[in-house]
Amino acid sequence: EDELQVIQPEKSVSVAAGESATLRCAMTSLIPVGPIMWFRGAGAGRELIYNQKEGHFPRVTTVSELTKRNNLDFSISISNITPADAGTYYCVKFRKGSPDDVEFKSGAGTELSVRAKPS
């Protein structure tokens, strides 16, 4: 049986300031059971970018409909990009735990670079 893989197809994405950035992520399986989250950076200091279950992320939208059945596309779009958004973004699968979910597998990361807004 093939273990779930987290696929971030782009190693890097370049976006002009003020535009939206699409960060692509796909899973190869629905199991193990558990949520997917997006982070900027790695390690203990990483920043949570999107978690559907809790939190408020007004600049983030999901590419696939939140009501799509058995979805494997966990791409996101971040609006109104600024230079402060530059960094490496990771799509991370968690295994359901009780009480706490456990990180299962991370994508390889996508580096977001921000170009100056065209004048």
Partner: antibody, heavy 120, light 108 residues
């Protein structure tokens, strides 16, 4: 067409054991989590256990006594029930899990159920 | 554990009338709620998921609404085959998955 067919129910004495099976067809079994739900006579639905790939989850009422497993090569889900009690008497349903995008699981297909009676 | 409370326990309705079933969660479950129908001697059948989306093949007279802690299943015009027990289930925070106690819709 998705089909789930439970078997293995019957009458067992308190403290005894049973193994339930659920034969699945009509979908890619190994790609989906699977769940057991039970219903005591005249009562409501109670979640029992769920299995993903290697990940398993149990209701407190059965933890340490029941073991869920799956054989993807046989498209079959199992529930090993040990140290059975009178309060485990119920119809046991196996169900296929479905997810909505980033959210949790609900159950889109159910078997017809198998009755387990624990009585001396 | 999230507790789901369904009301009323029994609803007596005449064929052709509207039936409104309630499911209240003890804490916010966003839209992570499903509704099932169960007839005597049969397995449950999925009707609604994500609080408001009808499962394929479910008649349009069934509709779901609500979010957070208050949810409603409405059957706009009851047909004879709709008399059954209806359960809600939350999948926002688990284990455990929890079901409501059920609402029996009976013929008035």
């Amino acid at each position: 067409e998705v089909q789930l067919l439970e078997s293995g129910g019957g009458v067992v004495q308190p403290g005894g054991s049973l193994r339930l099976s659920c034969a699945a067809s009509g979908f890619s079994f190994s790609n989906f989590a699977m769940t057991w739900v039970r219903q005591a006579p005249g009562k409501g639905l109670e979640w029992v256990s769920t299995i993903g790939s290697g990940d398993t989850y149990y209701a407190d009422s059965v933890k340490g006594r029941f073991t869920i497993s799956r054989d993807n090569s046989k498209n079959t889900l199992y529930l090993q029930m040990n140290s059975l009690r009178a309060e485990d008497t119920a119809v046991y349903y196996c169900a296929k899990d479905s997810t909505v995008s980033w959210s949790g699981d609900f159950f889109d297909y159910w078997g017809q159920g198998t009755l387990v009676t624990v009585s001396s | 554990e999230i507790v789901l409370t369904q009301s009323p326990a029994t609803l007596s309705v005449s064929p052709g009338e509207r039936a409104t079933l309630s499911c209240r969660a003890s804490q916010n479950v966003k839209n992570d709620l499903a509704w099932y129908q169960q007839k005597p001697g049969q397995a449950p059948r999925l009707l609604i998921y994500a609080a408001r989306i009808r499962e394929t093949g479910i008649p349009a007279r069934f509709s779901g609404s609500g979010s957070g802690t208050e949810f409603t299943l409405t059957i706009s015009s009851l047909q004879s085959e709709d008399f059954a027990v209806y359960y809600c289930q939350q999948y926002y925070d688990w284990p455990p998955f929890t079901f409501g106690g059920g609402t029996k819709v009976e013929i008035k």
